[in-house]
Interface confidence: low
């Protein structure tokens, strides 16, 4: 139903859902913090804008006693939970932050009259792509999957002279929340990953995934997996790799790979590394300091999810524009905004674009090195190493199928 | 190899302004960022601005707040707009352009004037920049 919103009258009020069920294993307390310093910043700018308003967030908490699984199998529920708990407190601001988890936004988008904005840092699956006020601040499965099959049908790069159209996809059900969407979309047949791919299997068991390593007759030489390194390691061991697998591991929310004097373990010479591009302003700032790199992702989603509100506040109000329209909910998309850690780019619909980096390890100096970059707003790759020092056969990635064209 | 070509610099009063441009051309596919460094005679090229590709500057303690880089990516031109020059501003001016394929280097921490390790960067001829008292 249509709740009132804390929305005009120089005050403006954002609504924080803070949920037990969320897509990283957060502290709320260290959310909070985000919030509050995004909210710092806001006034800071609207203040120096000549702006004199005030704005808030009411953290908006569930009781946990049902919904307390933790993760996001049980957020379905608890989002629209505290949706009504909003409706009978006439509590709602001028945007929604949170929730996190693909279930629980794509339930609560559909059950409500969506006349404000919804934020959200997660809801990574398909189910939440083109939603007219829901804007994403963390990378969704759709931009993985272009660059994917851009990278694929790439052909003319020194180090990739084959177009890819195979991959095997290891999926056994205990991956992470974006892991698990990401590789959801890579497995739907309806997908656009799909589409393009003329073979793909689900290995869905550990030893599938292992008996593929070395055998013979296997249909694709790619594997694609979603985790970091560790998560590899406990499926793959030591264990011999033909010469011609390609493993890529997506990890886009880790730093680690970028950290100073880290190495690169052999068991990582047959992997090529999908990650962001890292910021760095987090580094030093006070709700940061004891998050692991992923949680520095999801926090930094949060503070900028305050920002771009900021940013279309100071918008609405330097032009005399309404805040509690349509007009407003649908504008938090195909724009560029001053984020915490430098400029944020959302697409047409409101999902948020960046740089996504190819690693390899290098066999020389046995450190992560950048293959190419791949910028998501514009579907392009960009190779940054030409001559890399692969473990692959002549410095080249190989063919997709074993015995298809020179090797 | 990038080229990169200075102008802009000349001699001003203390207090005076100058605005310095540097048209870059060339493979630029693997740029982190681009910045300003000075050299006086005698003395370790500094590092005073530089701003990543996705347009994050950072400045020397020294010229804080006077001194303002920017870019015009379009036009593949770095600009450094210095107001309140001192005397001690006098120097030669040098544009570059930092690239590297290891991964560290797409952190832009990396690219701060303070700690910015000068493998992998092109750089300009330079300009001469002189503020009398």
């Known amino acids: 139903s249509q709740v009132s919103q804390n929305c005009h009258n120089g005050s403006y009020e954002i609504s924080v859902l803070m949920m037990g069920n969320s897509a990283f294993a957060e502290p709320l307390k260290n959310l909070e913090d985000a919030v509050n310093e995004g909210l710092e910043i806001v006034r800071g700018r609207l203040q120096n804008a000549g702006l004199n308003v005030t704005v808030n967030a009411t953290f908006m908490y569930s009781d946990g006693l049902i919904h307390n699984s933790g993760d996001c199998r049980s957020s379905t529920c608890e989002g629209l939970d505290l949706l009504r708990k909003i409706s009978n407190a006439q509590r709602m601001g001028c945007v929604l932050i949170g929730p996190s988890c693909t279930y629980s936004t794509f339930q609560m988008y559909l059950d409500t009259e969506l006349s404000y904005p919804m934020i959200s840092a997660g809801s990574f699956g398909l189910s939440c792509d083109y939603k007219e006020t829901l804007t994403r601040l963390m990378s969704p499965a759709r931009k993985l999957m272009y660059f994917l099959v851009n990278f694929w049908k790439t052909n003319d790069l020194p180090f990739k002279t084959y177009s890819w159209s195979t991959s095997y996809v290891y999926k056994n059900g205990t991956e992470t929340e974006d892991c698990f969407w990401y590789l959801n979309a890579l497995e739907a047949s309806v997908s656009y990953f799909s589409h393009e791919l003329g073979f793909k299997v689900v290995l869905r068991q550990d030893k599938e995934f292992q008996d593929i390593l070395m055998d013979h007759n296997r249909k694709s030489n790619v594997i694609i997996m979603c985790g970091g390194p560790e998560f590899l390691y406990k499926l793959k061991g030591d264990r011999a790799v033909a010469e011609d697998i390609v493993i890529i591991l997506v990890d886009l929310f880790n730093d680690q790979y970028f950290e100073d004097n880290v190495t690169a373990p052999d068991y990582m010479k047959n992997v090529l590394v999908l990650t962001l591009s890292p910021g760095n302003s987090l580094l030093n700032s006070s709700f940061s300091r004891n998050l692991s790199p992923t949680k520095r992702d999801f926090a930094l989603a949060y503070l900028n999810g305050i920002l771009l509100f900021g940013h279309m506040l100071k918008i609405f109000l330097e032009n005399g524009e309404n805040i509690t329209t349509p007009k407003f909910a649908h504008a938090f998309r195909n724009l560029t905004f001053e984020g915490y850690d430098g400029p944020v780019t959302l697409d047409d619909w409101g999902d948020v674009d960046s740089t996504m980096v190819l690693l390899y390890t290098s066999v020389d100096t046995k450190k992560y090195k950048v293959l190419l970059t791949y910028d998501t707003h514009v579907n392009k790759t960009y190779p940054v190493d030409m001559s890399p020092t692969f473990t692959w056969k002549n410095s080249k990635l190989p063919n997709d199928i074993t015995g298809r064209g020179p090797q | 190899q990038v080229h990169l070509v200075e102008s802009g610099g000349g001699s001003v009063q203390s207090g005076g302004s100058l605005r310095l441009s540097c048209a870059a051309s060339g493979y630029t596919g693997r740029r982190l960022c681009r910045g300003w460094f000075r050299q006086t005679p005698g003395k370790e090229r500094e590092g005073v601005a530089t701003?990543?590709?996705?347009?994050?500057?950072s400045y020397a303690d020294s010229v804080k707040g006077r001194f303002t880089i920017s870019q015009d990516n379009a036009k593949n031109t770095l600009y450094l707009q210095m107001n309140g020059l001192k005397p001690e501003d006098t120097a030669m001016y040098f544009c570059?352009?930092?690239?590297?394929?290891?991964?560290?280097?797409?952190?832009?921490?990396?690219?701060?004037?303070?700690?910015?390790?000068?493998?992998?960067?092109?750089w300009g001829q330079g300009t001469q920049v002189t503020v009398s008292s």
């Open positions: 701003i990543t590709l996705s347009g994050r500057a």
């Open positions: 570059a352009e930092v690239r590297s394929a290891d991964a560290e280097w797409l952190n832009p921490l990396k690219c701060h004037p303070d700690r910015l390790g000068l493998a992998g960067v092109d």
